[in-house]
Interface confidence: medium
């Protein structure tokens, strides 16, 4: 054994070490090594990248790294019948069609396998009818539509522009109202930052371009055909039409010049509202149908996409632990894209290629971490989270019994403003505390730390000098493990000014323009934010491996649960006549809110003071911060939502990518007003108190003295 | 569906203050996680972030503006307000109120109202 394996005590020098031999230039090497071809998800050139990384990730010093394999369903389009849509006249002549490709970048008109626009998982058909637009298609834009506007999208075919929610629940509304069909579009409003030029001049969105992405309901189940167990070569395998998530309805998406020509026709209403109008030189009229003169010309898509199941590889890399090698810390992020994935993924990848090299190097100096260490390349994450549910589900029993902590690493970068991070409560102190040892790469901030540049650039909303974290939804790869198994979860990135640019993510997410040069060129010519989320992501897996008592704060959970208490309670008293009429009471889990208060603060102070050198004593306390997110999980799950289970956070139900907080409680009193049967839906509102006020108070008592 | 409408004179003598209303519709301003904020725009230039005012009654301001600006809040009527004391020209600018929320993206922008600083 080395000597830092020998004593329990990390030397400081340690980390220093750690971060010192992380590369700005290496990062940038990986980089473009990564993003020369696509790599779609089943692809053999994924597979080959898979090797590569295998191989590489040996070198580098793991102790061990293999491959893992799972079956599972992913969705093409067909090569020899491409889809598009088109506008027919009366006789059902085609008089326009949309592209059937975007035009390739300067460099890359030469490269093979670029898989054209398609919105992943969409049935095949050959629906036509009248157009109704239908705004970014969320709840409340449905609501507008058939509640104020009285339009009905039974039978037509609606165009939605991308933007503010996950489009698989833009796609599962549309179905909800009756439409045949869903044309998908990215708006100039939401998709081209103002005084930026069009790539490859810039870092917006060229007419041209379109976002492909899947369009898929999941609710946490991975592959549509094995939900909650792997997809191996002796799974149990449903029929397609007992499939999870599937979409019932063709949908395609297309760019804003094959928008224009859609939207300029149309008539009907004019839009309710200015939050209606894009940036587009067309009315944003809804509709239904074309305007007067061109009233007999109709929409028809043409979708012959397929559903294959296909074999898809994870790797999976090991640093084994010298002190506590049954407690893993995890580091995962995909390495699948659809196209050459210049931001989605690989941003991400060189990051976790960079971090894997610097923990190899320290090992090969005779270093290891107290616990291990896994690292994961993903497959078909943009299929679904699918590579990442699916070993999860086949290693469940040892995650839940040894996981600590799970790291994201998807995209370093969707801006170069400041930092942005999502994580559970147990980690703001170790995120505060390691951004305060950081240099921040922010002009203006030389020789400042980085916590004070992201303070300053994005204040918390509720605590003075503090930065603003979020809440972890969905739409990544940690979802499994925070929202199914309930291991403490997080991620962070660089990020754009969300109060300057209010596009919706980045412009040229999910098209073929996402390249090498588009970070090269315009959003990090050093770097030098790829390098400051490198040290974060691994200065966080550092501290999270290596820390003698876990790096988890207790105490903070119990704040965010008396905030999440108070906003839910807030929304629940819009109906103070109906809380009285069915005595809903939210005492119970004020009550159990504060029990948890008490009893973090009990457990902390107890931190601060035992007997750090009794090795019994040391695990059974840091078992108890280990356990504390398991302890919010519900076995049962969210009504309609078994695998999302976590009882205080849970993706939104109308947007995967954003948190909601008390979800089941949430849930129950959405649009609680026009339910049929007040008193049914009120009392699964009291159930729903029930059961997070019974989950907070039982996850309070696994930080009391344990006799 | 919340909309936002900034509201306020047009034009304000240098050494004056500005008053600014936000008036929300859709959404009560006091029962849910969002904090509300106002914004500028110089002509030819980038928002500028002047503070905002969280559900729970937390009031934070842009360091560089904070000894002139206050924010304040009418739950009673909906709106949120904006002072600003001893203005100059260079406080000249379209203002923004604003609706964030815990989540990235949870963005939403009034249509601005243009200020202009002259005697």
């Known amino acids: 054994k080395s000597s830092n394996e020998a004593t329990n005590i990390t030397p400081k020098h340690n980390m220093k070490a750690f971060l010192d031999e992380l590369k700005a230039e290496n990062i940038k090497k990986f980089l473009y090594n990564f993003t020369q071809i696509p790599h779609l998800a089943g692809t053999e050139q994924n597979f080959q990248l898979a090797k590569q990384i295998q191989s590489q990730w040996k070198e580098f010093g793991l102790d061990s790294v293999e491959l893992a394999h799972y079956d599972v369903l992913l969705s093409y389009p067909n090569k020899t019948h491409p889809n598009y849509i088109s506008i027919i006249n009366e006789d059902g002549n085609e008089i326009f069609n949309t592209s059937l490709f975007e035009p390739p970048p300067p460099g890359y008109e030469n490269v093979s396998d670029i898989v054209p626009p398609f919105s992943a998982f969409s049935p095949q058909g050959m629906p036509e009818g009248d157009l109704v637009y239908v705004n970014y298609a969320r709840t409340e834009d449905f609501f507008k539509l058939e509640r104020d506007m009285k339009i009905n999208c039974s039978g037509k075919i609606v165009i939605a522009r991308y933007g503010k929610v996950f489009r698989g629940n833009k796609v599962k509304n549309a179905q909800l109202a009756g439409a045949k069909g869903v044309i998908l579009y990215s708006d100039p409003a939401d998709y081209f930052a103002p005084g930026v030029k069009s790539y490859p001049d810039g870092w917006n969105l060229p007419g041209g371009g379109v976002q492909r992405g899947n369009i898929l309901n999941l609710n946490g189940a991975g592959d549509p055909l094995t939900p909650g167990y792997p997809a191996n070569e002796y799974a149990y395998r449903r029929g397609i039409a007992e499939a999870v998530g599937l979409p019932s309805i063709p949908v395609h998406p297309i760019g804003y010049y094959d928008a224009q020509k859609l939207l300029e026709k149309m008539g009907g209403s004019a839009p309710p509202d200015s939050s209606w109008r894009g940036s587009l030189k067309v009315p944003y009229n809804v509709g239904p149908g074309f305007t007067g003169n061109f009233s007999t010309q109709k929409v028809k898509m043409h979708i012959h996409s397929t559903n294959e199941v296909t074999r898809i590889y994870n790797v999976i890399g090991t640093l084994r632990g010298a002190v506590e090698p049954d407690r893993y810390v995890i580091l995962g992020g995909h390495r699948d894209s659809w196209v050459f994935g210049g931001i989605d993924p690989q941003s991400g990848a060189a990051v976790v290629h960079e971090i894997v090299r610097s923990f190899g190097t320290l090992k090969k100096e005779g270093w290891r971490p107290r616990r291990t260490i896994l690292f994961a390349s993903w497959d078909a994450e943009e299929f679904g989270l699918l590579g990442s549910t699916e070993w999860a589900e086949e290693n469940s029993r040892l995650l839940q019994e040894r996981g600590v902590a799970y790291i994201n690493a998807d995209s370093s970068i969707e801006g170069n403003y400041t930092l942005r991070v999502d994580c559970t409560p147990l980690m703001y102190s170790l995120v505060h505390n390691l951004t305060k040892e950081l240099k921040s790469p922010d002009e203006g901030f030389e020789g400042k730390s980085l916590y004070e540049s992201w303070t300053k650039k994005s204040p918390s909303p509720e605590f003075s000098g503090m930065p603003r974290i979020s809440k972890l939804g969905s739409g990544n790869d940690f979802e499994v493990f925070f929202q199914r198994l309930g291991i403490a979860s997080g991620r962070a990135r660089y990020t754009k000014n969300w109060e300057t640019n209010k596009f919706s993510g980045y412009p040229l997410y999910h098209s073929v323009y996402e390249t090498y040069e588009l970070v090269e060129k315009f959003y990090d010519p050093m770097f030098k934010y790829h390098l400051t989320v490198a040290q974060v992501r691994g200065g966080m897996v550092f501290e999270l491996a290596n820390s003698i008592v876990l790096p988890f704060d207790c105490r903070d959970y119990a704040v965010v649960l008396r905030k999440y208490a108070d906003k839910i309670y807030s929304i629940s008293m819009k109906h103070p006549q109906e809380m009285k009429t069915y005595s809903v009471s939210f005492d119970s889990l004020f009550s159990a809110v504060k029990n948890f208060t008490e009893i973090a603060s009990k457990f902390s102070e107890r931190l601060q003071d035992f007997d750090k050198s009794n090795p019994i004593v040391l695990r059974m306390m840091n078992d108890q911060l280990m356990f504390l997110e398991r302890a919010f999980i519900d076995p049962l799950g969210l009504p309609d939502r078994p695998f999302y289970r976590h009882v205080i956070y849970a993706p939104s139900s109308h947007n995967k990518y954003a948190g909601e907080s008390f979800p089941g409680i949430y849930d129950a009193l959405f649009d609680i007003e026009s339910k049929v049967d007040p008193s049914k839906a009120w009392g699964e509102v009291k159930r729903q108190i029930y059961v997070a006020a019974f989950t907070v108070q039982a996850a309070a008592e696994t930080l009391s003295e344990v006799a | 569906q919340v909309q936002l409408q900034e509201s306020g004179p047009g034009l304000v003598k240098p050494s004056q203050t500005l008053s600014l209303t936000c008036t929300v519709s859709?959404?009560?301003?006091?029962?849910?996680?969002?904090?509300w904020s106002w914004v500028r725009q110089h002509p030819g230039k980038g928002l500028e972030w002047i503070g905002f005012i969280y559900y729970n009654g937390s009031i934070h301001y842009n360091p560089s503006l904070k000894s002139r600006v206050t924010i304040s809040v009418d739950t009673s009527k909906n709106q949120f307000s904006l002072k600003m004391s001893s203005v100059t020209a260079a406080d000249t600018a379209v203002y923004y109120c604003?609706?964030?929320?815990?989540?990235?993206?949870?963005?939403?922008r009034g249509q601005g109202t243009l200020v202009t600083v002259s005697s």
């Open positions: 859709g959404g009560s301003i006091s029962n849910s996680g969002y904090y």
């Open positions: 604003a609706r964030d929320g815990d989540d990235y993206g949870d963005y939403l």
